[in-house]
């Protein structure tokens, strides 16, 4: 049984979400990793992914999303810059391990973006400056498409920070939809 947990991040429009996904095991260091959004009753949609194999400290950018994999720490750093209200939602990191299902990394991120002056932090504990400098060299990676059978996962409850759902077997869905966003110049 897997206990699904999530953390809530409340930020203002224009700010940057800066989170880390802990993949723990060294064997996953070079595995391709992805950042997904989970919409109620739908399969997770992949927004961005690292290269395959995933390179150490090598930024990958898809639109406003930047992924950096730090093998020395077992962490995937995810940044979403210039946040918009419509970015609000539930996100997760996964590790691609074909032909098996993607391996989910805890915790899921419940992002709430509100309108307002972006210079005012949404929270003094979990927000970052709204000005963000894009890394000079970034790569756009192609995310894989899976074609094996899939099931729609039940969307977890909309909840506050650090709330756990009851222990239950989860069926991680395969990825079919890739959201493409223009890459910054």
């Amino acid at each position: 049984a897997t206990k699904l947990t999530e953390e809530k991040y409340e930020l203002k429009e224009g700010q940057t979400l800066d989170v880390k996904c802990d993949y723990t095991l060294e064997k996953f260091a070079s595995s391709q990793k992805a950042w997904q959004i989970i919409r109620d009753g739908e399969m997770p949609k992949t927004l961005a992914c690292t290269e395959r194999p995933s390179k150490n400290s090598h930024p990958v950018q898809v639109g406003r999303i930047i992924l950096e994999d730090y093998h020395d720490h077992g962490l995937l750093r995810v940044r979403m810059v210039n946040l918009q209200v419509e970015d609000s939602g539930l996100y997760q990191c996964v590790i691609y391990q074909p032909p098996k299902e993607p391996h989910m990394l805890f915790d899921r991120i419940r992002l709430v973006v509100t309108k307002g002056f972006s210079g005012t932090p949404g929270s003094n504990e979990n927000s970052t400056q709204n000005v963000y400098k894009i890394p000079p060299t970034t790569t756009k990676a192609l995310c894989p498409l899976y074609t094996s059978p899939r099931t729609v996962t039940q969307a977890p409850p909309k909840s506050t920070a650090d709330v756990s759902t009851p222990d239950s077997e989860i069926n991680l869905t395969n990825v079919t939809d890739i959201i493409r966003v223009p890459v910054f110049n």
């Epitope: 897997t2 206990k3 953390e7 991040y9 979400l17 800066d18 989170v19 880390k20 802990d22 723990t24 095991l25 060294e26 400290s57 950096e68 730090y70 020395d72 720490h73 077992g74 962490l75 750093r77 391996h103 989910m104 990394l105 805890f106 003094n124 504990e125 979990n126 927000s127 970052t128 650090d162």
Partner: antibody, heavy 117, light 111 residues
């Protein structure tokens, strides 16, 4: 080479405050988590809390929540532990650590905090 | 919070012998297919050193004689053949739930 160096340990009176520093070299603290752990003389290890220096998000052990504050300055590649309302039972060697394997690794040498009147 | 109980409190062995240290958690520390149970070694006057992470994976630069096993609530650290430098205090620690917690330690001493 990865290195963490703690400083700021001192003798302080009960009720007093102290700020410890953890200077990192060989890696960027913004790309990892920094944890603080302490060890009272002759006792075991106790996790205090951690920070994601890039996002500023913190987690604490209930025992120190409200009295201790972890912060970080990524431009200085340094993390901090602000300790207020100190008690004699806070006497310990304080370690900062990096993160690896889902837990704490890359330990500093520790700095001694003595709370006594 | 999750309570970790280590046994024995003290283990007296000779170099070359096999050491088996146990750690029991008050609730499961396994999630997402991973057991978040780690082992540290600490010698007097030194900082702890990560030996085993995620129950069974060796930390960087750790000799092959150190191995870990277990899942759920019961875990074991095994040192296949003790070297003189292995005599120290060993702590188990869980990183499954905040607050992270440590066991009380097992002192491995020379017989």
């Amino acid at each position: 080479e990865v290195q963490l160096v703690e400083s700021g340990g001192a003798l302080v009176k009960p009720g007093g405050s102290l700020r410890l520093s953890c200077a990192a070299s060989g890696f960027n603290i913004g790309n990892t988590y920094i944890h603080w752990v302490r060890q009272a003389p002759g006792k075991g290890l106790e996790w205090i809390g951690r920070i994601d220096p890039a996002g500023g998000r913190t987690k604490y052990a209930p025992k120190v929540q409200g009295r201790f504050t972890i912060s970080a300055d990524t431009s200085k590649n340094t993390a901090y532990l602000q300790m207020n309302s100190l008690k004699t039972e806070d006497t310990a060697v304080y370690y900062c650590t990096g993160h690896y394997g889902g837990t704490m690794d890359y330990w500093g040498q520790g700095t001694l905090v003595t709370v006594s009147s | 919070e999750i309570v970790l109980t280590q046994s024995p409190a003290t283990l007296s062995l000779s170099p070359g012998e096999r050491a088996t240290l146990s750690c029991r958690a008050s609730q499961s520390v396994s999630n997402y297919g991973i057991s978040f149970l780690n082992w540290y070694q600490q010698k007097p006057g030194q900082a702890p050193r990560l030996l085993i992470y995620a129950a069974e994976y060796q930390g960087r630069g750790i000799p092959a004689r150190f191995s870990g096993s277990g899942s759920g609530t019961d875990f074991t650290l095994t040192i296949s053949s003790l070297e003189p430098e292995d005599f120290a205090v060993y702590y188990c620690q869980q990183s499954s739930n905040v607050p992270y917690t440590f066991g009380q330690g097992t002192k491995l001493e020379i017989k």
